[in-house]
């Protein structure tokens, strides 16, 4: 419901931190030449840095990253029947974030 | 750290539900005619539907939406001095989500 008229509360800044985002598993990540298959699941959750910083010269960026391999199903349709295969996709999770100057290269440990 | 070699766990679907997202408060939301000002905060958190559904014919869409007015600061620079004014921005939070067929219009209560 849109609710009754409410007092406008002060807006709170969305601080620079990790948040859960949805990552789409594109078929082209699995197989670039063949389009006759499905990927399951089609999307997964990842942790990503987001939010804003005090001024436009700094950006919210990851300072620590972890690569996470996950197993997906590649479902090929052969003679109208599904054939299940396994494939691995490497996801990127951000573990820590920082407001960094735009031009600075960021270290990833 | 990029971590050592780990076993690929089965990927879990990012289900259709509300997640916290970052909404950038564009200056054009406050004043379309004047660009000589800053907005604070530059971004806020909102709740939005995201995730994926069982097939491509359905999409994760909000079934319930709430409008939330928030107060931001409009900082005008006049003769090199900041002048603080208040402005209200109406944010849209998604309260509930559902996998709906793409063609269907979504009811918002």
């Amino acid at each position: 419901s849109l609710g009754s008229l409410t007092i406008a509360e002060p807006a709170m800044i969305a601080e620079c931190k990790t948040r859960t985002e949805v990552f789409e598993i594109s078929r082209r990540l699995i197989d670039r030449t063949n389009a006759n298959f499905l990927v399951w699941p089609p999307c997964v959750e990842v942790q990503r840095c987001s939010g804003c910083c005090n001024n436009r010269n700094v950006q919210c960026r990851p300072t620590q990253v972890q690569l996470r391999p996950v197993q997906v199903r590649k479902i090929e349709i052969v003679r109208k029947k599904p054939i299940f295969k396994k494939a691995t996709v490497t996801l990127e999770d951000h573990l820590a974030c920082k407001c960094e100057t735009v031009a600075a290269a960021r270290p990833v440990t | 750290s990029l971590g050592s070699l780990t076993i690929a766990e089965p990927a879990m679907i990012a289900e259709c539900k509300t997640r916290t997202e970052v909404f950038e408060i564009s200056r054009r939301l406050i004043d379309r005619t004047n660009a000589n000002f800053l907005v604070w905060p530059p971004c806020v958190e909102v709740q939005r539907c995201s995730g994926c559904c069982n097939n491509r014919n359905v999409q994760c869409r909000p079934t319930q939406v709430q409008l939330r007015p928030v107060q931001v600061r409009k900082i005008e620079i006049v003769r090199k001095k900041p002048i603080f004014k208040k402005a209200t921005v109406t944010l849209e939070d998604h309260l509930a989500c559902k996998c709906e067929t793409v063609a269907a219009a979504r009811p918002v209560t």
């Epitope: 990552f23 789409e24 594109s26 082209r28 990540l29 990851p62 990127e92 990833v108 | -």
Partner: antibody, heavy 120, light 107 residues
């Protein structure tokens, strides 16, 4: 249809800076690693920088390390290359390319390139 | 760094000819080898990836072979639109490196 459009090239003096942009469309930009490759006039191809899908991992060759910075804004489907302390030998056409699911992939789609000329 | 050496640097051929270009890596790169075609004033175009996989939309007259250090790009019957410069590239380790290129010209 996949499209990559570079911009931001131009004439700059030695020691100067430039920021290149690459606008992506036609694919899920946030799912793919992206790369910059350059080509000096009449010369071959040289890899310049790569960035992971989420922007958390970057790779550079020694020739540009500490001078060039690659970044991306997935919300805007945009890739960037900040060029600092430019030298005459950085004069080249700079291409952005989509490079698959990791650094060890091929360069599947390319933009048309933007020319950077470093000269006094 | 892995050096990629292409040969020849240029060749002249006629339409219908079979053309072979070789690429040698300074150390083993398994099958992490890609081939690109570039025409003057244009961006490179991916032809072959993973040494022998034909990129979608590329004519079947192009083929790739090899593993380890020695690789070959073959054009079985050269067509007018194939006159261009060809580059190999290793994606086995960083820095990613390209061969010097092979220019295929009309005889």
């Amino acid at each position: 249809e996949v499209q990559l459009v570079e911009s931001g090239g131009g004439l700059v003096q030695p020691g100067g800076s430039l920021r290149l942009s690459c606008a992506a469309s036609g694919f899920t930009f946030s799912s793919f690693w992206m790369t910059w490759v350059r080509q000096a006039p009449g010369k071959g191809l040289e890899w310049v920088a790569s960035i992971s899908a989420g922007g958390g991992i970057t790779h550079y060759p020694d020739s540009v390390k500490d001078r060039f910075t690659v970044s991306r804004d997935n919300a805007k489907n945009s890739l960037y290359l900040q060029l600092n302390s430019l030298r005459a030998e950085d004069t080249a056409v700079y291409y952005c390319a989509e490079s698959g699911g990791d650094i060890y992939s091929d360069f599947d789609y390319w933009g048309q390139g933007t020319l950077v000329t470093v000269s006094s | 760094d892995i050096q990629m050496t292409q040969s020849p640097s240029s060749l002249s051929a006629s339409v219908g000819d079979r053309v072979t270009i070789t690429c040698r890596a300074s150390q083993s790169i398994s099958n992490y080898l890609n081939w690109y075609q570039q025409k003057p004033g244009k961006a490179p175009k991916l032809l072959i990836y993973a040494a022998s996989s034909l990129q979608s939309g590329v004519p079947s007259r192009f083929s790739g072979s090899g593993s380890g250090t020695d690789f070959t790009l073959t054009i079985s019957s050269l067509q007018p639109e194939d006159f261009a410069t060809y580059y190999c590239q290793q994606s086995y380790s960083t820095p990613l490196t390209f061969g010097g290129g092979t220019k295929v010209e009309i005889k």
